[in-house]
């Protein structure tokens, strides 16, 4: 229509951290060159003081040297470290260059700080000089405090680095640096490349998601390149050696560190925080610079890295709104079948239990309020004289009364008893005269047996029952509220296995059941449990939601039923219900 906004044509960007149904899924930051534009600390740069350097080229058997001046004070003649990580234009190469002839045992180091943990895929260097004869790449995982080798290059691995030459990589040593003589040729004299791929040849690379060893192996906060030995033509010790020595130096046009900001599958981007530090923009209820822990109150299961198959999002503790803190208990998690390990701390509103799910001693449940209500637990108020203790029945609130005492709080004498002055036996039997009148009839509540058969909970499900009903859904009862002659249950519809004319959608809905049906346990239903509900279409009091009654089947959910119900669903689509 004419009132459309100017942005109407722009579709909202899909959220990489959740699927089209809003369920969490693994997400990872973009692949970047983490070195681009970053400062590199180098141990040597030519030009301070200005110095001659000579570039060697070859024409057939002839070696030609053209000499230039490196001057750090002259931008046109300087070769600073910034040239390592600037925009690499092949038509206008800018090269960092070391001082001349820093030959073994002296080395030259380049140190790049990435600012946070990255998962590094490759480290590459493009040379303006010949490639080094020996060179090592190191990584730090603790912001430069300690260093471990990543890769060695040398024509003499044993002599230079005390490593075997091209050692085979096995599952047992896949997190160890190897030494190779590839990429160590002196030629080309300019433009040569050294590229180290962190996962190349590592046996578990194909199953990276399930290899903590390799996940650790590719993780780095800093990268260091150490040039150990220059390639020479062997003329550096001849009479006219000064010219030769001025021809030997390290020069690099481009340093790249390809990889992704490490967020363990729980963030799609990294951002700058208030301290200007690079951190993951964590999702899935995770926290920390690498989304490497669960955010407060989301400790119902252990933190885990996301995988292609599972988002492994952190789950909030279930404390029924009565606690602000919880902690994770691994053993309870395992005992629950690896479902829930959160233990609520300091339950408030007179609740108790691991999930603040029952009332503490001296209190009982007000069944008219959901367990999440602030006043779900009422004080027992047991009479100090009439009651035998302070703890009442958790559901009815009935206090334990002394002999001859009655009332929910044990505050009066029972029929046939009279008050005494003793606090030990506050009610004593009235001496009984022989009976003269017929016992007055007490009106019984309506007999549930004649109204309906209360379900025993051991019901079987079969195709016939499935076909008879208009709808079949898996529900999770969240809370219950009394509404006149009805009970209104707030339920989460987890799966829909059958639906009639009224379209049932997944998500939170109302389930209406008449109070009389609930009183007679037809159906028997409890909050916080999961059920399979099979029922018939009927108008609900609020024209939305679904209705269940004494003819509905409500059975406590079992995970094994999912497959069976999907089969029934397929059979129904093929018209099998008509035959049944």
């Amino acid at each position: 229509g004419p009132g459309l906004s100017m942005f109407a044509g722009q579709a909202a960007q899909p959220d990489p951290c959740s699927d089209e149904n809003g369920h969490p899924r693994r997400c990872i930051p973009d692949f970047v060159n983490a070195a681009f534009g970053k400062d590199v600390r180098v141990s040597s740069t030519c030009g301070r003081p200005p110095a001659r350097y000579c570039v060697v080229s070859e024409r057939g058997e002839e070696r030609l040297r053209s000499c230039h001046l490196c001057n750090a004070s002259d931008p046109k003649k300087a070769h600073p470290p910034a040239f390592l990580t600037d925009l690499n234009n092949p038509h206008n190469l800018t090269c960092w260059q070391s001082e001349n002839y820093l030959q073994f045992p002296h080395n030259v180091t380049l140190t790049l700080s990435l600012g946070k943990k990255f998962e590094v895929t490759y480290v590459s260097l493009q040379f303006c000089s010949p490639r080094p004869e020996s060179m090592a790449i190191y990584k730090s995982m603790d912001y430069g405090r300690t260093w471990v080798p990543f890769q060695f290059y040398s024509t003499q691995c044993r002599k230079m680095y005390n490593r075997p030459h091209r050692a085979p990589i096995t599952k047992q040593n896949e997190q160890e640096a190897v030494c190779t003589d590839s990429h160590t040729d002196m030629r080309p004299l300019s433009g040569g490349l050294i590229a180290f791929s962190t996962l190349d040849g590592r046996p578990s690379a194909h199953d990276f998601d399930n290899s903590p060893v390799l996940q650790d192996w590719v993780t780095a906060t800093d990268i260091r390149v150490a040039f150990s030995r220059l390639h020479t033509f062997g003329d550096e010790n001849e009479d006219d050696s000064e010219l030769a020595r001025d021809s030997y130096f390290y020069a690099v046009s481009d340093l790249q560190v390809g990889g992704r900001c490490k967020c363990n599958g729980h963030a799609a981007r990294c951002v700058r925080d208030r301290d200007d530090s690079l951190v993951c923009d964590c999702r899935h209820n995770t926290a920390g610079p690498e989304c490497d822990r669960c955010k407060p109150f989301h400790y119902d299961r252990p933190w885990q890295r996301a995988t292609a198959r599972e988002a492994n999002e952190c789950v909030a503790c279930n404390c029924n709104l009565h606690a602000r803190r919880c902690r994770f208990n691994m053993e309870l998690y395992k005992l629950s079948g690896r479902k829930s390990g959160g233990v609520c701390l300091n339950c408030r509103h007179n609740t108790a239990g691991r999930h603040c799910h029952y009332c503490k001693e001296g209190y009982y449940r007000d069944m008219g309020k959901p367990i999440t209500h602030r006043k779900a637990c009422k004080a027992c108020d047991c009479h100090p004289v009439g009651a035998a203790g302070k703890t009442c029945n958790q559901t009815t609130g009935q206090c334990p009364c002394k002999d001859g005492v009655t009332g929910i709080t044990c505050n009066r004498c029972a029929k046939g008893y009279q008050q005494s002055r003793s606090p030990i036996a506050p009610c004593i039997k009235i001496p009984v005269a022989p009976p003269t009148t017929a016992a007055s009839s007490v009106e019984e509540p309506e007999d549930c047996d004649s109204y309906c058969k209360a379900s025993k909970g051991k019901l079987k499900i079969n195709m016939k029952k499935y076909c008879k009903k208009d709808y079949a859904v898996q529900i999770h009862i969240l809370k219950a509220d009394k509404a006149g002659d009805w009970w209104k249950f707030t339920v989460n519809i987890i799966s829909v296995y059958k639906q009639g004319t009224s379209r049932i959608r997944r998500g939170d809905q109302s389930l209406w059941i008449r109070s009389r049906d609930i009183a007679c346990k037809c159906p028997k239903i409890k909050p916080l449990k999961k059920y399979l509900l099979l029922g018939n279409a009927e108008d609900s009091p609020d024209q939305s939601g679904i209705v269940a009654d004494k003819s509905s089947l409500v059975i406590q959910w079992r995970d094994t039923w999912a497959r069976r119900l999907r089969k029934f669903q397929q059979r129904e689509k093929k018209g099998k219900c008509k035959k049944a």
């Epitope: 309870l332 395992k334 233990v343 108790a352 239990g353 691991r354």
Partner: antibody, heavy 116, light 107 residues
Framework: QAYLQQSGAELVRPGASVKMSCKAS????????MHWVKQTPRQGLEWIGA????????SYNQKFKGKATLTVDKSSSTAYMQLSSLTSEDSAVYFC?????????WGQGTLVTVSA | SIVMTQTPKFLLVSAGDRVTITCKAS??????VAWYQQKPGQSPKLLIY???NRYTGVPDRFTGSGYGTDFTFTISTVQAEDLAVYFC?????????FGGGTKLEIK
């Protein structure tokens, strides 16, 4: 140092019940699960179940549901296990063990003999 | 429930020998495996937890390894006091289960 002291040996008639105790000391009783393990020469070690004294939550091996009932008394730092409807199959040594990372602390065991 | 199959049932060795006991889980239990030693008339004693971690005070001749379904317990140099029954146990998923035990006897 954690220590678990179990009650003495029991000789009981078939069909009867028995309740044994495990008194804990040297650690925060409410912070660790208390597990119960049965040992017989024929079946070896079998895990019966566990109770979390912090709130009384229990977890049972399906095989022992209805046979064993686990309870605690926080005030005395004592865990209890009641075995009901005893038969000769229930004759065994029963251990309590503190949970955590593996069962690092065990009681000395209670021998139960079921005999007519 | 997860079945822990322990082999061998009996081991007759001399002091100084190297001993290896294996435990196979019927499904993956990650590294949630412990090993216990039980001497005659005593309660079991924890030696190894999380498959390869030696418990406090346990001599370094006792080692454990494995992940998933296959686990190994090794005594590098058997001593006379190592005469006992050794059990593996998984606590990955309830119900916790034990291996059948390996009785170690010294010649």
């Amino acid at each position: 140092q954690a220590y678990l002291q179990q009650s003495g040996a029991e000789l009981v008639r078939p069909g009867a019940s028995v309740k044994m105790s495990c008194k804990a000391s040297g650690y925060t009783f409410t912070s660790y699960n208390m597990h119960w393990v049965k040992q017989t020469p024929r079946q070896g070690l079998e895990w019966i179940g566990a109770i979390y004294p912090g709130n009384g939550d229990t977890s049972y091996n399906q095989k022992f549901k209805g046979k064993a009932t686990l309870t605690v008394d926080k005030s005395s730092s004592t865990a209890y296990m009641q075995l009901s409807s005893l038969t000769s199959e229930d004759s065994a040594v029963y251990f309590c063990a503190r949970g955590g990372t593996g069962f690092a602390y065990w009681g000395q065991g209670t021998l139960v003999t079921v005999s007519a | 429930s997860i079945v822990m199959t322990q082999t061998p049932k009996f081991l007759l060795v001399s002091a100084g020998d190297r001993v290896t006991i294996t435990c196979k889980a019927s499904q993956s239990v990650s590294n949630d495996v412990a090993w216990y030693q039980q001497k005659p008339g005593q309660s079991p004693k924890l030696l190894i937890y999380y498959a390869s971690n030696r418990y406090t005070g346990v001599p370094d001749r006792f080692t454990g390894s494995g992940y998933g379904t296959d686990f190994t317990f090794t005594i590098s140099t058997v001593q006379a006091e190592d005469l006992a029954v050794y059990f593996c146990q998984q606590d990955y998923s309830s119900p916790w289960t034990f291996g059948g035990g390996t009785k170690l006897e010294i010649k």
